[in-house]
């Protein structure tokens, strides 16, 4: 199957990478991390057509049996393919550390 | 936050492993797999609420935005975390051959 | 053009206080954090410490900590690395740089600030 | 504190040549590593961030792999301007530390 890019739904509706700007407080994080204060969130949102960004051979089983039991079998989803890391600034028993997080930011999308 | 595996909306509704029973020609394969004829297909099937299953702090991230801006942040979904390895007895030029595909039966499931 | 630009080479005598500046622009200084450097003759690098310029936090390398003192002033996009009393050891070449927290790198360096320390 | 090891800490090589430099972590860093390249005189230039993701404005000949605790650095033909010292550098957690560099010289 291809593992097509072009969105048969129109520009902008299909599996892609989004930001969404969020605070502390947004991401539930205001009691123990310091910084940064604001994040800008990659993730990755969007419809799952028929052989668009297909991660592997089992969304292909998957959007098949979708359309053959649309009330048993879901759609493809939309999910991160791999990630940004990102470090933050957070609070410890002692004072403050850095801590790096390689699974928070999403780099590029498919669906699964 | 919890990696909780205790589903709030009751039992067998939230994410987890299902099997589905396939012929070929449901998978779309009838015209270059012989054998096996029917696979039992496992994949990830429910809904992720809050903590259910979070595979990683991006899960994290998306189900608090979910809550915020639920009409632009779409709940976390449930997508495999591994996968089975599956043996296909397929159709080549020169007759048959087996191929090993690692990414076709979903193995366990998480919530991203 | 983004730059960090540090200020020139000092030379002191052991128990002097000294403060050396890196100053940004072409960015907003806020986005980012600021690391120091060091790297002592013929040697290699050596992570001291970093700060949050927006809301002042400082995390040093245990090995710095008590030593020297990173600090900030926003309103003019500057970085400061002071001594309250030198020493010979203090001898190096120290670099400021931008850290990117998305991604997690050094991604725009000064040019370096010489400190010699020497009776 | 998390021990970065470099090797070799110096090698020799021509122009053409393929080169690798490998880091070890005294523990697990995930992919939290980043590559520099010093040349004397000069700040030290971010090559590869991520354990394997090459900085924008850096010849795709520099790659980086690994994961955990053992990482490679490999410079699939050695050019000129490549002759410098490398440097890994783990941001795992606080504190930060640099690996003591690998010097590549001309054979």
């Known amino acids: 199957a291809r593992n097509g890019d072009r969105c048969p739904l129109g520009p902008g509706r299909c599996c892609r990478l989004h930001t969404v700007h969020a605070s502390l407080e947004d991401l539930g994080w205001a009691d123990w991390v310091l910084s940064p204060r604001e994040v800008q969130v990659t993730m990755c949102i969007g419809a799952c057509p028929s052989q668009f960004r297909e991660a592997n051979m089992h969304a292909q089983i998957k959007m098949n049996l979708h359309r053959l039991k649309p009330d048993t079998v879901p759609a493809p989803c939309c999910v991160p393919a791999s990630y940004n890391p990102m470090v933050l600034i957070q609070k410890t028993d002692t004072g403050v550390s850095l801590q790096t997080y390689d699974d928070l930011l999403a780099k590029d999308c498919h669906c699964v | 936050a919890r990696n909780g595996d205790r589903c709030p909306l009751g039992p067998g509704r939230c994410c987890r492993l299902h099997t589905v029973h396939a012929s070929l020609e449901d998978l779309g394969w009838a015209d270059w797999v012989l054998s096996p004829r029917e696979v039992q297909v496992t994949m990830c099937i429910g809904a992720c609420p809050s903590q259910f299953r979070e595979a990683n702090m991006h899960a994290q991230i998306k189900m608090n935005l979910h809550r915020l801006k639920p009409d632009t942040v779409p709940a976390p979904c449930c997508v495999p975390a591994s996968y089975n390895p599956m043996v296909l007895i397929q159709k080549t030029d020169t007759g048959v051959s087996l191929q090993t595909y690692d990414d076709l039966l979903a193995k366990d499931c998480h919530c991203v | 053009e983004v730059q960090l630009v540090q200020s020139g080479a000092e030379v002191k005598k052991p128990g002097e206080s000294l403060k050396i500046s890196c100053k940004g622009s072409?960015?907003?200084?806020?986005?980012?954090?600021i690391s120091w450097v060091r790297q002592m003759p013929g040697k290699g690098l050596e992570w001291m410490g970093i700060?949050?310029?927006?809301?002042?936090?400082?995390i040093y390398s245990p090995s710095f900590q008590g030593q020297v003192t990173i600090s900030a002033d926003k309103s003019i996009s500057t970085a400061y690395l002071q001594w309250s009393s030198l020493k010979a050891s203090d001898t190096a070449m120290y670099y400021c740089a931008r850290v990117s927290y998305y991604g997690g790198y050094f991604d725009i360096w000064g040019q370096g600030t010489l400190v010699t320390v020497s009776s | 504190d998390i021990q970065m090891t470099q090797s070799p800490s110096s090698l020799s090589a021509s122009v053409g040549d393929r080169v690798t430099i490998t880091c070890r972590a005294s523990q697990s860093i995930s992919n939290n590593l980043n590559w520099y390249q010093q040349k004397p005189g000069k700040a030290p230039k971010l090559l590869i961030y991520a354990a394997s993701n090459l900085q924008s404005g850096v010849p795709s000949r520099f790659s980086g792999s690994g994961s955990g605790t053992d990482f490679t650095l490999t410079i699939s033909s050695l050019q000129p301007e490549d002759f410098a010292t490398y440097y890994c550098?783990?941001?795992?957690?606080?504190?930060?530390?640099f690996g003591q560099g690998t010097k590549v010289e001309i054979k």
């Open positions: 700060i949050d310029p927006s809301g002042s936090y400082t």
């Open positions: 550098f783990q941001l795992d957690h606080s504190p930060f530390t």
């Open positions: 072409g960015y907003s200084f806020t986005d980012y954090w």
